[in-house]
Structures are given as structure tokens and as C-alpha cells.
């Protein structure tokens, strides 16, 4: 099908024209411009950048560009009372203190307003006590400690290494274990790739580098004081005691030089196995407390950060659709950074800027997309996806009726090995078809398609000859659109080789060393990977906004639903006796999946044959495609997580970053063998199967012939 038919325009204004207009050199210039000073949410610098982007998007040719502001709860260190951790002796004297700041990178020594490393939303406090090393502080790590090793974390300060799961889950787990403080650190095993030098000589984390980040457990709520509603001028705000997702114990992050000093003295139990050892030259003893000579020494935290209601600013740009202006395709990424944001977020923001420029160029030449494209520069993503969530709360009625798709645009790179895509199954075919048309930027794949290099380097575990596409989890601005509103969503970026680099994220993530130079010297000197990501993100937006029939394939949803049903059934079948005792059956779910598969197949046949020149029928078919994702939304939400409403996907309860399929059933089954009331627990499993089966069946019926 040709996108040109959409708005009856000249053939030169097609996808190729849009892609050809994207330039690596522009992305490079934009990245440089966005990374010279810090743009922390709630600061004047970030407000000024919002106004600059507003002005430039207008110049690029968008129809309108507005600032949308909200007053949300943010968190900052106390400028005169710094946060740190000490080792104290028996007299209470501080004999060792962790560093108060990261040594600035070369060329940035005189930059002001670099926020020191802190855990955003940590409460104030000065707890002191014995240390317990809890590995990654995952659910399974606390199971190992409490159940197998009989180590009690109650009243202890725990030290956990970053990686594997979202830091907020670590803190939640520590709280549930009774800890009175949490120290987070970056172990070189996870943040130092072998054979690579530390910054500024390479892309590895130096010993003084520290990962900042929020430690909330919002579960999709947005601003902690106004869950469900926008934090506008007349908002009713909860008291801090009723705020959503705030941690109850002090938390602070440190680098591995400081961690070495704490961990080298650890006594108590030896680590349970090698998976608990990092790369520092320390025993990785679990504790509690320090070894022999140092047993009278304790650890003390000094946390003085404050939570403050602060104004934030989204930039919302509109390119009105010529044929279906009431159908919205959204491209959004955040603008706020912890410090310079060399990768997160500005490598993404620079790509969005260039995509806007390219669309604007086409518009100035007389072209318009078929559907409206909205461009967003979100604020306060780092503080809990606040800007995007507040805007979506404010515009939820419009979005649920008009939202076709949301494409996320945070960091364009987390490596330079191959493409990484997470998206709704509805977009699988769109992504496959698009990447087949794009050139691979990879060495050794000259003249080959992006699809080919991607498939070779990151093959699908299920389907040979196809690339891996992952489930959407959370930890980024698509969350509200996908998990709460049920708008088809996707994200794409260039990533590392997960086989050879098992560190978590990229080493300099959320540190002061995430600079323009990091990208320009070590990750993407030619900006060819950035350009490829711009082509993927921009190409997806172009097709979603311009194709006559929406580029969604509902048959791909049928395939994954069967896979997810098989998976959850096999998890349940680990308890055959209980399934028999409590009459647990998955028949309804498998039946619903079978129905969905058949109806989706028939819908796809009709989609090939219908009269596309009939605008009413075209709109009807497109609406069925648009509303399919919406049909997976349960208005009541998941148990204890009312803003996670998607029945097929939710962020894992144990790791916000990861997506879980049939999350309601999964959570009901999780650790079911330890539940005190098995009858009640298995009753909840049955209820969740019922909800899932009903939802799949109901979604299938939205694809049936309307009359």
C-alpha cells in the first residue's frame, strides 16, 4: 500500500522523502545543544530548555506548540546539609565518610548546579546499625536470606547492588524485610565491562561514579499527591502521609570505591553462592555487621533531602491531520535529566527534534499527514514519569477516544550493537516491514537491511528468521498510554550485545559522566546509530499517521496470547495437586484465545477485501484496529494496582522495568506455596483466570463483524 494515497499529495512527499530529510549531523548538533548544562526537572534551566524547544518546533513548522505545566511532588538534596554515609566507631565518631559528590568530568569542573548523587524521594533520617549485604535486593534474594539463611534484616541497614531490577523494587523489598535504611551501589560486575577503560578514557564507570534515580513505587499513579487526576491549579493534594509510593526508610546511592570500604569489613555469613559475588576484592559476606576487629563499628546514614511541590513543563507540539484530525499518533520522550543527560534523555530528545524538523519541512512544502501527530517533550520523567502521566490524566478522555498509537523516544542508544524494540504485538508487522526497508548501520552489514542485521544479532527465541521483539514493561513515559489507557505503544533504541555484556543498562547511566563526549567519542562518533533510531521511530510515526489502513496486525496478538496462556498454564501446573483440589481450570482462557485467533483471522481477511474508497467502512475498520488495544483494559485495574489496567501486560510486581504477561494470574500464582490460606489463594487464581478469559473473549468480539 502507498502512504501517498492518504492525503492526495504529490508522490515526492512519501515515507522516503521524510526519511531522506533526517540527518545525522543535525542530531549531533541538537545533542550538543541539549547537553551543555544540567536540565534537572523543576529547575530554571529545564524551563528555559522547554521554551527553546517550543520556539524551535514552531520554527520547524508545527501548527501549534504549547507548554503544559503541572505542580508535582519532586525531591532534592539539601544544598547546605549534604547526604552521606559513615562508618562510626563505638564512641560514635565518624571514621569514614562516603564522598559528597562525583569528581566532575574534564571540561565540566566549573559547571554549577550539578545535583549530587541522591535517591529521589528518600525520607530524611539518620539511622545507624549493622549492615546486611542483600545482593540485588530482588524478591528471590530476600527469600534466600530469610528462608534459607535465616538472616533477619529487621532493624538493619541493607546494602544492595544496582542492576537486574528497578531500584524502587529493591527499596520496597528492603522495607518489607524490616530494614531501616538502604545503601545502593554500582558493582563493577554490573557496571564495568571487561577490557574497557573508565570515563574519560572509555565508557566504563569510574569508582567515584554514582547512579542517581527515584525510588518510588508509584505503580502508574503519576504525581504522588494527585493520583488519577492532573496536578493542576485547582488540584486537591493528599497529605504527605497519604502520598502514593513514597519510601518509608532512608536510601542513598554510592560508587564502588565507597562500597569497597563498607563491604571489605563485612562479617557474618559467607555469600550463599557465586551469584552473590561481584567483582570487588571483598568477601561479599552477608553479615549482619562487620568482622572481628571491626565488630563494634556501625554504619550511619545521614539523609536530609526534601520533597517539594514544584512546577514542571511539558512541550506539546501538534501537526494537524488532513483527513482524520481527530486521530492522534503521539511521539514523546522526556527532556529532564539527572545531570547532563548525554544519553538519557538527550540522545532521544535530539532524535525527536530532528524528526519534528523533517515533518515540518514536508509540511512547509504543502504536505500533511492523514492523522494528527502530537509531539511531546515530557518533564520529570526521572521523578516517576510525572510529566507524561499528568498530561495523560488531564487529556484522558480525548486520548481514550482518539489515541491511535504512542511511540516512546527516551535514550536512542544504550549500546551500539543492534536494534532493540519493545512494542505491542499489533506493531510487530509494522516494525518488520519498516526495518526491511531501512539500511543497517552495522559494520559487516553494508548494503544489507536493518532487519537482516537485527535478526542475525538478536534472533527471536521462538521464530527462526525473525528478530526478537520484547514485551513492554515500564520505567518510561509510554506507561500511562499503554498500561493505563490501552493505547498501542512501542519503543526502539540501539542496544548492547546482551550475550557478552551482562552489566545492567550502560555503565554511566544517571551519573555525571553521561556527557556529550561519552556519545561522540565512544558510542556513536558518526551518529549513524542515532540516525537509524530516528528512521525507525520516525518511520513508525509516519506509517501510523499516514497509512490508509492502520498498520496493525491483530493476528500477531492471537499468536502471543496463545504463547502467554501456555506459559501461565505451565506455571500453574507446577502445583498439580492443588489444581485438582481446588478445581482450577484454564479451559475458559484457552477457549477465549482460540476464539480470538479465529475472529482475528477472519477480520484480517475482511481487511484485505473491503472497499477502501468508502470512508465510512474504512473508518469503521480502522476504529476496530485502534480500539483493540483498548479492549484489553479492565476498568477496575489489577489487584492493588488500579492504574495498571491492561490485562495482557503489566510491569512485573518484582521489577518495574520488565513486562509480565497475564499479570493478574501470574501474581496470584507467585509464591502460592507459602500462602497461609491456600483455599483463598487458589480462589484468587481462579478469579484471575476468569478475568483474563473474559477480557480476551471481549476483545475478540470487538473484531467481529459489527452487524
Amino acid at each position: 500500500k502507498s502512504s501517498n494515497e492518504a492525503t492526495n499529495i504529490t508522490p515526492k512527499h512519501n515515507m522516503k522523502a521524510f526519511l531522506d530529510e533526517l540527518k545525522a549531523e543535525n542530531i549531533k548538533k541538537f545533542l550538543y545543544n541539549f547537553t551543555q548544562i544540567p536540565h534537572l526537572a523543576g529547575t530554571e534551566q529545564n524551563f528555559q530548555l522547554a521554551k527553546q524547544i517550543q520556539s524551535q518546533w514552531k520554527e520547524f513548522g508545527l501548527d501549534s506548540v504549547e507548554l503544559a505545566h503541572y505542580d508535582v511532588l519532586l525531591s532534592y538534596p539539601n544544598k547546605t546539609h549534604p547526604n552521606y554515609i559513615s562508618i562510626i566507631n563505638e564512641d560514635g565518631n565518624e571514621i569514614f565518610n562516603t564522598s559528597l559528590f562525583e569528581p566532575p568530568p574534564p571540561g565540566y569542573e566549573n559547571v554549577s548546579d550539578i545535583v549530587p548523587p541522591f535517591s529521589a524521594f528518600s525520607p530524611q533520617g539518620m539511622p545507624e546499625g549493622d549492615l546486611v549485604y542483600v545482593n540485588y535486593a530482588r524478591t528471590e534474594d530476600f527469600f534466600k536470606l530469610e528462608r534459607d539463611m535465616k538472616i533477619n534484616c529487621s532493624g538493619k541497614i541493607v546494602i544492595a547492588r544496582y542492576g537486574k531490577v528497578f531500584r524502587g523494587n529493591k527499596v520496597k523489598n528492603a522495607q518489607l524485610a524490616g530494614a531501616k535504611g538502604v545503601i545502593l551501589y554500582s558493582d563493577p560486575a554490573d557496571y564495568f565491562a571487561p577490557g574497557v577503560k573508565s570515563y574519560p578514557d572509555g565508557w566504563n564507570l569510574p569508582g567515584g561514579g554514582v547512579q542517581r534515580g527515584n525510588i518510588l513505587n508509584l505503580n502508574g499513579a503519576g504525581d504522588p499527591l494527585t493520583p488519577g487526576y492532573p496536578a493542576n491549579e485547582y488540584a486537591y493534594r493528599r497529605g504527605i502521609a497519604e502520598a502514593v509510593g513514597l519510601p518509608s526508610i532512608p536510601v542513598h546511592p554510592i560508587g564502588y570505591y565507597d562500597a569497597q570500604k563498607l563491604l571489605e569489613k563485612m562479617g557474618g555469613s559467607a555469600p550463599p553462592d557465586s551469584s552473590w559475588r561481584g567483582s570487588l576484592k571483598v568477601p561479599y559476606n552477608v553479615g549482619p555487621g562487620f568482622t572481628g576487629n571491626f565488630s563494634t563499628q556501625k554504619v550511619k546514614m545521614h539523609i536530609h533531602s526534601t520533597n517539594e511541590v514544584t512546577r514542571i513543563y511539558n512541550v506539546i507540539g501538534t501537526l494537524r491531520g488532513a483527513v482524520e484530525p481527530d486521530r492522534y499518533v503521539i511521539l514523546g520522550g522526556h527532556r529532564d535529566s539527572w545531570v547532563f543527560g548525554g544519553i538519557d534523555p538527550q540522545s532521544g530528545a535530539a532524535v525527536v527534534h530532528e524528526i519534528v524538523r523533517s515533518f515540518g519541512t514536508l509540511k512547509k512544502e504543502g504536505w500533511r499527514p492523514r492523522r494528527t501527530i502530537l509531539f511531546a517533550s515530557w518533564d520529570a520523567e526521572e521523578f516517576g514519569l510525572l510529566g507524561s502521566t499528568e498530561w495523560a490524566e488531564e487529556n484522558s478522555r480525548l486520548l481514550q477516544e482518539r489515541g491511535v498509537a504512542y511511540i516512546n523516544a527516551d535514550s536512542s542508544i544504550e549500546g551500539n550493537y543492534t536494534l532493540r524494540v519493545d512494542c505491542t504485538p499489533l506493531m510487530y508487522s509494522l516494525v518488520h516491514n519498516l526495518t526491511k526497508e531501512l539500511k543497517s548501520p552495522d559494520e559487516g552489514f553494508e548494503g544489507k537491511s536493518l532487519y537482516e542485521s537485527w535478526t542475525k544479532k538478536s534472533p527471536s527465541p521462538e521464530f527462526s528468521g525473525m528478530p526478537r521483539i520484547s514485551k513492554l514493561g515500564s520505567g518510561n513515559d509510554f506507561e500511562v498510554f499503554f498500561q493505563r489507557l490501552g493505547i498501542a505503544s512501542g519503543r526502539a533504541r540501539y542496544t548492547k550485545n546482551w550475550e557478552t555484556n551482562k552489566f545492567s543498562g550502560y555503565p554511566l547511566y544517571h551519573s555525571v559522566y553521561e556527557t556529550y563526549e561519552l556519545v561522540e567519542k565512544f558510542y556513536d562518533p558518526m551518529f549513524k546509530y542515532h540516525l537509524t533510531v530516528a528512521q525507525v521511530r520516525g518511520g513508525m510515526v509516519f506509517e501510523l499517521a499516514n497509512s490508509i489502513v492502520l498498520p496493525f496486525d491483530c493476528r500477531d496478538y492471537a499468536v502471543v496470547l496463545r504463547k502467554y496462556a501456555d506459559k501461565i498454564y505451565s506455571i500453574s501446573m507446577k502445583h498439580p495437586q492443588e489444581m485438582k483440589t481446588y478445581s482450577v481450570s484454564f479451559d475458559s482462557l484457552f477457549s477465549a484465545v482460540k476464539n480470538f485467533t479465529e475472529i482475528a483471522s477472519k477480520f484480517s481477511e475482511r481487511l484485505q477485501d473491503f472497499d477502501k474508497s468508502n470512508p465510512i467502512v474504512l473508518r469503521m475498520m480502522n476504529d476496530q484496529l485502534m480500539f483493540l488495544e483498548r479492549a484489553f483494559i479492565d476498568p477496575l485495574g489489577l489487584p492493588d494496582r488500579p492504574f495498571y489496567r491492561h490485562v495482557i501486560y503489566a510491569p512485573s510486581s518484582h521489577n518495574k522495568y520488565a513486562g509480565e504477561s497475564f499479570p493478574g494470574i501470574y501474581d496470584a500464582l507467585f509464591d502460592i506455596e507459602s500462602k497461609v490460606d491456600p483455599s483463598k489463594a487458589w480462589g484468587e487464581v481462579k478469579r484471575q483466570i476468569y478475568v483474563a478469559a473474559f477480557t480476551v473473549q471481549a476483545a475478540a468480539e470487538t473484531l467481529s463483524e459489527v452487524a
Epitope: 564495568f192 570500604k261 570487588l280 576484592k281 571491626f294
Partner: antibody
């Protein structure tokens, strides 16, 4: 760049004490342990011990315990090593060396050495 | 204490030819985290020792690639692929896995 500058040569009588200094620059002093290594033609290189400038924690070689004391002054980024009850076989070149911490855990930077002569 | 034994103690080499020094420890140098903290130092006449290779096989910054290290457990080797005049000096192996840290007796490399 990292530099360790040691104090000048010393001549001491048996039974006396000697206190050597090692001034560090070009890096964050409290992050890296300072070790002391001596070199004699007879014994070769001998590790005497180390000090953690951050907390002052020391780790001595048993062969020198009771005779060696390592201290530091964080305000001047200087480490000190005092050796008491000197004997003629303590005549040696004494080096301070910075432990490179992760990923090295080796002595990545050495001072120029201080010659100590013990003679009656 | 861990005893480090080097051989040979003296190594005359022709310029441009390879050289190899062996180092054996009295016990395993594998630390509990799986790393082996065996290092090689070079000491040129009248100078302080200088780190050459750390953790068995990793060249320290600025060290030419003609130097390489290998080995595991208790047996280790330093190789120079093509000896140059500036390589003259004494080479020490050392371990920092166990306290106290210990050094080999040194191998004196000289030009034939």
C-alpha cells in the same frame, strides 16, 4: 596526573625510629590505600603494610607488627610510615605505593623511594 | 605467607628475540570472587618499580603490547614478544590475593 612524592634520605642509629612521608596529588586521596614496600638486595621487595586514608584502617605485615605505624593526614593528602627499634638490616629503599583499587588491586603508582641507612 | 618463586633469576636475551619469565606461587591465587590477583612489575636501573601487567593478563595503561601475561592457579608467565633495549631491568611477579602481599625474587633481564 597521579604523583607520590616521598621525603628525603635518612641516616639513623640502631634502636632509633624513622618517620617517612608520602605526599599524594592528582587524585582523591581518601579513595585509594597507600602501601609501603621496602627493597633490600638480600630480601628483595617486601610489603610492609597499608593504610586506608578514608578511615585510617591499617593492615600490617606480621613481620613488622609492633615496629611499624602507618598514619595519614587527609588535610594535606599525606601518608606516614614510622618504623621503630631500627636494626642494620632495616637499611633499605622504602617506597610508598598507591593501591589502584578496582579493577587493578595492584600497586599502580609508586613514589620515588626514600633511602634509609641504619648504621652505628 | 604465600611464597612466589621466579625463574630464571637471570635472563640474557638477544634484541628482537622473545623472552619468557615464569612465576609459581605456593598456593592458589584465585580469590573468592573468581579473580586472580597476580601482577608483574618492571624496575629499570635506578628507578622505582612500575606496574606492567595486572590480574594475570591485563596490560596497565601505557604498557606496550609486546608484553603479555598468562597462567592460572599457581603457575604464571610473563612474555615479551620482541625484546627491545629499553626492556632491560628486573621483573617481579607479585600477588595481592592473600595478606601479606608478596613478591618474587626478581628476574634480571639483560641484553646478550
Amino acid at each position: 596526573q597521579v604523583q607520590l612524592v616521598q621525603s628525603g634520605a635518612e641516616v639513623k642509629k640502631p634502636g632509633a625510629s624513622v618517620k617517612l612521608s608520602c605526599k599524594a596529588s592528582g587524585y582523591t586521596f581518601t579513595y585509594f590505600d597507600i602501601n609501603w614496600v621496602r627493597q633490600t638486595p638480600e630480601q628483595g621487595l617486601e610489603w610492609m603494610g597499608g593504610i586506608s586514608p578514608g578511615d585510617g584502617n591499617t593492615n600490617y605485615n606480621e613481620n613488622f607488627k609492633g615496629r611499624v605505624t602507618m598514619t595519614r593526614d587527609t588535610s594535606s593528602s599525606t601518608a606516614y610510615m614510622e618504623l621503630s627499634r631500627l636494626r642494620s638490616d632495616d637499611t633499605a629503599v622504602y617506597y610508598c605505593a598507591r593501591d589502584g583499587n578496582f579493577p587493578y588491586y595492584a600497586l599502580t603508582n609508586w613514589g620515588q623511594g626514600t633511602t634509609v641507612t641504619v648504621s652505628s | 605467607d604465600v611464597v612466589m618463586t621466579q625463574s630464571p633469576l637471570s635472563l640474557p636475551v638477544t634484541l628482537g628475540e622473545p623472552a619468557s619469565i615464569s612465576c609459581r606461587s605456593s598456593q592458589s591465587l584465585v580469590y573468592s570472587n573468581g579473580n586472580t590477583y597476580l601482577h608483574w612489575y618492571q624496575q629499570k636501573p635506578g628507578q622505582s618499580p612500575r606496574l606492567l601487567i595486572y590480574k594475570v593478563s591485563n596490560r596497565f595503561s601505557g604498557v606496550p603490547d609486546r608484553f603479555s601475561g598468562s597462567g592460572s592457579g599457581t603457575d604464571f608467565t610473563l612474555k615479551i614478544s620482541r625484546v627491545e633495549a629499553e626492556d632491560v631491568g628486573v621483573y617481579f611477579c607479585s600477588q595481592s590475593t592473600h595478606v601479606p602481599y608478596t613478591f618474587g625474587q626478581g628476574t634480571k633481564l639483560e641484553i646478550k
